[in-house]
Interface confidence: medium
């Protein structure tokens, strides 16, 4: 995300009252049929060609519907604001036939004191203010309405919520004489949901709260609160689920300890500890009760908060996440890495894998990367032969079937997909790595050698000769 290169003031508009009926307006279809790709998996190309041809033939009837853009809506309740007091908002693209709603929380690190928030405001204002937001955004990856790009939920109502609160979506404090900045991430989510109820969300069957990076952590922090909010507002039938991408961090020991000077070098536990106080941060109630006062920072870490959540959550996490490595003071500068660092990186993958062992719905490829779900090529990566959209489809089915008391995993439809090979990019479907300085693409063999991996050590556990392994990796097998 860009971030890597990175109350109420007074009584305002009430939320739209709950509808007495959730029926669609006259002439609107009740629900389009979601596509189940199970039957066509063997012949997906031909199926996609047919879908495309159908879409093109219908284009003149509904050109507006095929427009990829999500349109900006600034919150009508302008007291719910970005850091600088400008109104928060959301981008929306409706899909009138669908009762699925995808709400995506953007990521982009955070700031946790006046100094680094001032610096963030100077260098990354878009992440602290709505002042220069474009009027439209194109939906990509899981936010795309094209079946080819988004075979999972292409027909859903798409909502992109820009991150402008710098608080990992946890804050609940407004701008005042005392506070130079507002931190209202948790309130922004609540207000967006309230406004969307008047725009059709009231008739939803499923609300999927998704997010990447800080937005992924935001999902873990807010998913239960959204479910509770909808229940209180009179919509208990809406099933709330979470999809946390690249937001499952470890509070592990840094590779090299540094003082807490700025966002990047500060150990995550210390940054969050300071941040919570600065933001007036809120964490899920059931998690908060597990820790003493002043220890709420624990709830920002996936493996600690996840067991306390009531809503189903699907966790997507690269085993070698670049943001995790950054806060651990691992900087891959282009120089071959020393053995100590190589072991640290491998151990990180092992630790992460361990935290996911009791997460039934998870997708964790052994790649060095960050964020995936709104990338256009999010369908390309596979774990054990299964792509992420396919795994999400299986998750949907398992949740649907679990209402019928079936607890066994669906045959041929896995949802727990965690790579077991032990080094970065040992999964050949990982995104291409580029040399940081030349920008040249590196194949896996080049990358591993560059990382200082001894081919003998890597090849032996596989029962291979180093030359055989290099050949396999170079061919992408």
């Amino acid at each position: 995300s860009e971030g890597r290169k990175t109350w109420r003031r007074r009584g305002q508009q009430p939320p739209p009252p709950p509808r007495t009926e959730a029926a669609p307006a006259a002439g609107q279809p009740v629900e389009s049929f979601p596509l189940d790709f199970t039957a066509v998996e063997g012949n997906m190309d031909s199926f996609m060609a047919q879908v495309k041809s159908l879409a093109q033939s219908l284009y003149p009837c509904s050109a507006q519907q095929l427009n990829e853009d999500l349109r900006l809506h600034l919150l009508l309740n302008t007291s719910v604001t970005c850091n600088d007091g400008s109104p928060a908002g959301y981008y929306l693209k409706e899909s009138r036939g669908s009762r699925r709603w995808l709400l995506f929380l953007e990521g982009g690190w955070y700031c946790f004191n006046r100094e680094n928030c001032d610096s963030r405001y100077d260098t990354m204002r878009r992440l602290m203010s709505s002042r220069d937001w474009p009027r439209t955004r194109t939906g990509t990856g899981i936010l795309s309405s094209q079946p080819e790009e988004n075979p999972y939920w292409w027909n859903a109502n798409m909502v992109f919520i820009p991150y402008c609160s710098s608080d990992v979506w946890s804050g609940a404090s407004s701008k005042s004489e005392k506070n130079e900045y507002a931190f209202m991430g948790a309130l922004i989510i609540q207000e967006v949901v309230r406004e969307l109820l008047g725009r059709g969300l009231s008739g939803a069957k499923v609300l999927l709260l998704a997010g990447s990076s800080a937005g992924g952590t935001g999902v873990l922090l807010n998913v239960d609160r959204v479910a509770e909010q909808l229940e209180k507002l009179g919509y208990p039938a809406i099933q709330v689920r979470g999809l946390a991408d690249s937001g499952w961090f470890l509070d592990n020991k840094q590779y090299r300890h540094t003082d807490c000077v700025d966002t990047i070098t500060c150990a995550p536990t210390e940054a969050i500890r300071r941040g919570i106080r600065y933001w007036n941060g809120v964490v899920p109630e059931r998690c908060r009760r597990q820790f003493q006062e002043g220890e709420e920072w624990n709830c920002f870490f996936g493996y600690k908060v996840y067991p306390t959540l009531r809503c189903p959550v699907f966790v997507v996490q690269w085993l070698f996440d670049e943001a995790q490595l950054t806060v651990d003071n691992v900087h891959l500068t282009g120089q071959p890495v020393q053995e100590g660092l190589r072991l640290y990186i491998q151990n990180l993958g092992r630790e992460l894998r361990h935290t996911l062992k009791d997460v039934p719905a998870s997708f964790a490829p052994a790649c060095l990367s960050h964020e995936i779900i709104i990338r256009s090529h999010w369908t390309d990566v596979q774990v054990k032969g299964t792509s992420l959209p396919r795994a999400l489809h299986c998750w949907d089915r398992s949740l649907h079937d679990s209402h019928k008391a079936s607890k066994t995993p669906l045959k041929g439809c896995p949802v727990h997909l965690v790579d077991s090979c032990p080094w970065p990019h040992c999964n050949p479907s990982c995104p291409t790595v580029r040399d940081q300085f030349t920008g040249q693409e590196m194949n896996v063999a080049q990358f591993l050698m560059h990382m200082g991996f001894d081919m003998q050590t890597v090849a032996q556990p596989q029962g291979l000769e180093p030359s055989e392994l290099l050949g396999m990796l170079s061919n992408g097998s």
Epitope: R9, Q12, P16, P17, T78, P87, R131, G198
Partner: antibody
Framework: QIQLQQSGPELVKPGASVKISCKAS????????INWVKQKPGQGLEWIGW????????KYNEKFKGTATLTVDTSSSTAYMQLSSLTSEDTAVYFC???????????WGQGTSVTVSS | DIQMTQSPASLSVSVGETVTITCRAS??????LAWYQQKQGKSPRLLVY???NLADGVPSRFSGSGSGTQFSLKINSLQSEDFGTYYC?????????FGGGTKLEIK
């Protein structure tokens, strides 16, 4: 293209009521708030209130509570404002305007002139 | 309620000149402000939203600036079609009050 078409001029007696309409076209009516604005002859603009056609939710300027009532008919994509117990102070042009989601009133009706006179 | 004070109330300018109209809010409204142009006998037309953004179809000689309590609308190289009355309006909680207007006349 997007249009808000208002009903024609009205001449009414003091104490009576009047209902003016604003028919929307060119966009999905239930998605946008409709605001009403008053302009007395030779004077400035005054915000009366809004209605959200998606669910009938309303918000009024305290000054107009009790005199203005906002309603919608979604089947005809029409917003209405009823003004009751009229006095000469209510002689004005009344505009409907769409709230465009970006802190703005982006499309306006042509205005309806209401004259209160005995 | 928030008061919006516009100045000047009127001004007389020649074609080709540059003019700036200001609007002051009685409290901090951040960027929650719009500018409109109204010609005699017509409905208002949106020029600027969220303090600084030009609405579709508005010529680039118009520009909005400011945030907090002080805002301005600048018109460079005035054209004959720019004459009329200009209003600011806040959107920081209801009621959404308008400024008193600035009447721009041809000299």
């Amino acid at each position: 293209q997007i249009q808000l078409q208002q009903s024609g001029p009205e001449l009414v007696k003091p104490g009576a009521s009047v209902k003016i309409s604003c028919k929307a076209s060119g966009y999905r009516f239930t998605d946008y708030y409709i605001n009403w604005v008053k302009q007395k002859p030779g004077q400035g603009l005054e915000w009366i209130g809004w209605i959200y056609p998606g669910n009938g939710n309303t918000k009024y300027n305290e000054k107009f509570k009790g005199t203005a009532t906002l309603t919608v008919d979604t089947s005809s994509s029409t917003a209405y404002m009823q003004l009751s117990s009229l006095t000469s102070e209510d002689t004005a042009v009344y505009f409907c305007a769409r709230y465009g989601n970006l802190l703005d009133l982006d499309y306006w009706g042509q205005g309806t002139s209401v004259t209160v006179s005995s | 309620d928030i008061q919006m004070t516009q100045s000047p109330a009127s001004l007389s300018v020649s074609v080709g000149e540059t003019v700036t109209i200001t609007c002051r809010a009685s409290e901090n409204i951040y960027i929650n402000l719009a500018w409109y142009q109204q010609k005699q006998g017509k409905s208002p037309r949106l020029l600027v939203y969220a303090a600084t953004n030009l609405a579709d179809g508005v010529p680039s000689r118009f520009s909005g600036s400011g945030s907090g309590t002080q805002f301005s609308l600048k018109i460079n190289s005035l054209q004959s079609e720019d004459f009329g009355t200009y209003y600011c309006q806040h959107f920081w909680g209801t009621p959404y009050t308008f400024g008193g207007g600035t009447k721009l006349e041809i000299k």
